[in-house]
């Protein structure tokens, strides 16, 4: 479990859960809908998805110096995607199959975010815009775009935790 106040997270646990997230993100995408992605959707929901960038301290040197900057950025992204996966985009029509990996993906995002921020430790979370509902006809395309950007995000996060587990674990 991650520990508040700048100490190291449970790198190995985070590595395992982030690898699981990678697998789930790839198995959830592409989601087969009832129709082709014929209609262009509104870009709004996918424009401001969090990305891990150079200045976020997620490079080996940044992680060595102070991993908290990078971990906070990852935490913000996990919360952002967890909100999206819980929204009408994924729980409205067209309905996902009961055994869709999206439910597991949502739970794992929540699990990893809690591992990074246990109770009693509060990072400033980036203001998550309140999601305005998508029109039903937009949802398939939005799912596709969100899952594609989520894949990229969790791939970077998994590399961060793999590096941390290999070099920064006590």
């Amino acid at each position: 479990r991650a520990v508040p106040g700048g100490s190291s997270p449970a790198w190995t646990q985070c590595q395992q859960l982030s690898q699981k997230l990678c697998t789930l993100a790839w198995s959830a995408h592409p989601l087969v809908g009832h129709m082709d992605l014929r209609e262009e959707g509104d870009e709004e929901t996918t424009n401001d998805v969090p990305h891990i960038q150079c200045g976020d301290g997620c490079d080996p040197q940044g992680l060595r110096d102070n991993s908290q900057f990078c971990l906070q950025r990852i935490h913000q992204g996990l919360i952002f995607y967890e909100k999206l996966l819980g929204s009408d985009i994924f729980t409205g029509e067209p309905s996902l199959l009961p055994d869709s990996p999206v439910g597991q993906l949502h739970a794992s995002l929540l699990g990893l975010s809690q591992l990074l921020q246990p109770e009693g430790h509060h990072w400033e979370t980036q203001q998550i815009p309140s999601l305005s509902p998508s029109q039903p006809w937009q949802r398939l395309l939005l799912r596709f775009k969100i899952l594609r950007s989520l894949q990229a995000f969790v791939a970077v996060a998994a590399r961060v935790f793999a590096h941390g587990a290999a070099t920064l674990s006590p």
Epitope: M35, E39, S87, G92, S95, L131, Q135, P136
Partner: antibody
Framework: QVQLVQSGAEVKKPGASVKVSCKAS????????IKWVRQAPGQGLEWMGE????????IYNEKFKGRVTMTTDTSTSTAYMELRSLRSDDTAVYYC????????WGQGTLVTVSS | DIQMTQSPSSLSASVGDRVTITCRAS??????LHWYQQKPGKAPKLLIY???QSISGVPSRFSGSGSGTDFTLTISSLQPEDFATYYC?????????FGQGTKVEIK
Amino acid sequence: QVQLVQSGAEVKKPGASVKVSCKASGYTFTSYGIKWVRQAPGQGLEWMGEIFPRSGQTIYNEKFKGRVTMTTDTSTSTAYMELRSLRSDDTAVYYCAANWDLDYWGQGTLVTVSS
Amino acid sequence: DIQMTQSPSSLSASVGDRVTITCRASQSISDYLHWYQQKPGKAPKLLIYYASQSISGVPSRFSGSGSGTDFTLTISSLQPEDFATYYCQNGHSFPYTFGQGTKVEIK
């Protein structure tokens, strides 16, 4: 099997409020939205709005905005629809339903508004 | 709002007849069109979703077609249990809207 079980019939005076419940079982409650649809006696179907239990997000038909509130209690897999400032033309059977393409419907709750 | 117009509003038919109900949307809704059957005192029952997709457990005599603004529900051979009211529904955009219904009665 999947069931949506609604609360019993209600008789209300004009100006009052009514709160109808819809208890879901047989599926993961947070995986799908819950819609509310009403049907006045001898009339057609009218969508009132819906709520997404995983996020608490709501979408209301403009016609009912300001008078309707939809909520859920995920611990009991129950959805609620409250309609305020009731008028006689709100007399109808109120149905809860999960996503359209699932065909999970409640049995309906008759709300009668009469002085 | 998207208006859904069904025709006819009622029809009389005999067991074994082929019955066709049409639904027109006031603007294109692609294939986001669902058909329901409702019997008195009961909740609606989904017959066809996304214009032409059949539902498990619904008899194969029910079929749907169309895209854009014009849609059709066909009952290939009417059975005694099919006498009911049928509704089409816009599932494309908010607010979701229904047709006014088509009542199928015994001739």
